[in-house]
Amino acid sequence: DTQEKEVRAMVGSDVELSCACPEGSRFDLNDVYVYWQTSESKTVVTYHIPQNSSLENVDSRYRNRALMSPAGMLRGDFSLRLFNVTPQDEQKFHCLVLSQSLGFQEVLSVEVTLHVAANFSVPVVSAPHSPSQDELTFTCTSINGYPRPNVYWINKTDNSLLDQALQNDTVFLNMRGLYDVVSVLRIARTPSVNIGCCIENVLLQQNLTVGSQTGNDIGERDKITENPVSTGEKNAATWS
């Protein structure tokens, strides 16, 4: 049976995708065929076949970026070391080990789901401006994060969530494969408005919050909340 695993990695970091037999295993590299492939995009990540040192079948996206350790393979550790993780690496990776001496039966089959994350920049909230006499507009911008963020606006007077119908979010996939988000909030003009913009990265369980107040161009101190207990508490903790 295929084992299933999940692992997380930050964009730009290195990650190990585990595929290993129990400790104490010994393998002859002239006996095993090892293939690492992606399940969705159907690409060859790396492989080992007996008496063959060239890797001409490896996809260009993974050449020189994905390695198995020969010393590890002798011990039954066929784990993949993936360098400089990119958002495009967020896939299922399949490790398959076949033994020639066992009639090419599967020795090991592991599917590893790689989740990729990147921190969003601290949001920047523009000073409010008035497109009309009875309306105020705020803009919140945050860039270079992954995966796609959630954006919330808060009434900081009572820490309540503003109606999402008041905001218009535009999310861009930038040249690096990361997300940039711009959220525009339109609210009715009141004498004093104290609002905050929160960018939530669900995978990292991280919120970035910045505030803006009418009559004050300087946003409140930036705040980062990590590992909140639940969605409700997460928001409350961030907006205090």
Epitope: Y35, K42, V44, N57, H94, L96, F104, Q105, E106, S109
Partner: nanobody
Framework: EVQLVESGGGLVQPGGSLRLSCAAS????????LGWYRQAPGKQRELVAH???????VYPDSVKGRFTVSRDNTKNTVYLQMNSLKPEDTAVYYC??????????WGQGTQVTVSS
């Protein structure tokens, strides 16, 4: 379990050609590895060709340049084109398909005999 049925084997003279087919009972596009293997009497099973999910191929030196593996996803069939056959290619040829969710499936084999 996926059913695999090989066909196309037979008796051929040295230097001749044969084309083996392996028909699968389900879509072959979901398989990460499609393989052809052979086993001669008294010998262990050996690799003939691996067809990886993206279309890359792997051949042992013994058949490289003579054998070609291919697939037709619309027919759910894998092929092995064998040219310049030699007496030492005589064996039962097996088809194999592997997918993470389905495991490994084997066909029943087809006999290839190269003899004058």
């Amino acid at each position: 379990e996926v059913q695999l049925v090989e066909s196309g084997g037979g008796l051929v003279q040295p230097g001749g050609s044969l084309r083996l087919s392996c028909a699968a009972s389900r879509s072959i596009s979901s398989f990460n590895l499609l393989g052809w293997y052979r086993q001669a009497p008294g010998k262990q099973r050996e690799l003939v060709a691996h067809l990886l999910s993206g279309g890359s191929t792997v051949y042992p030196d013994s058949v490289k340049g003579r054998f070609t593996v291919s697939r037709d996803n619309t027919k759910n069939t894998v092929y092995l084109q064998m040219n310049s056959l030699k007496p030492e290619d005589t064996a039962v040829y097996y088809c194999n398909a592997i997918a993470p969710a389905l495991g490994s499936s084997w066909g029943q084999g087809t006999q290839v005999t190269v003899s004058s």
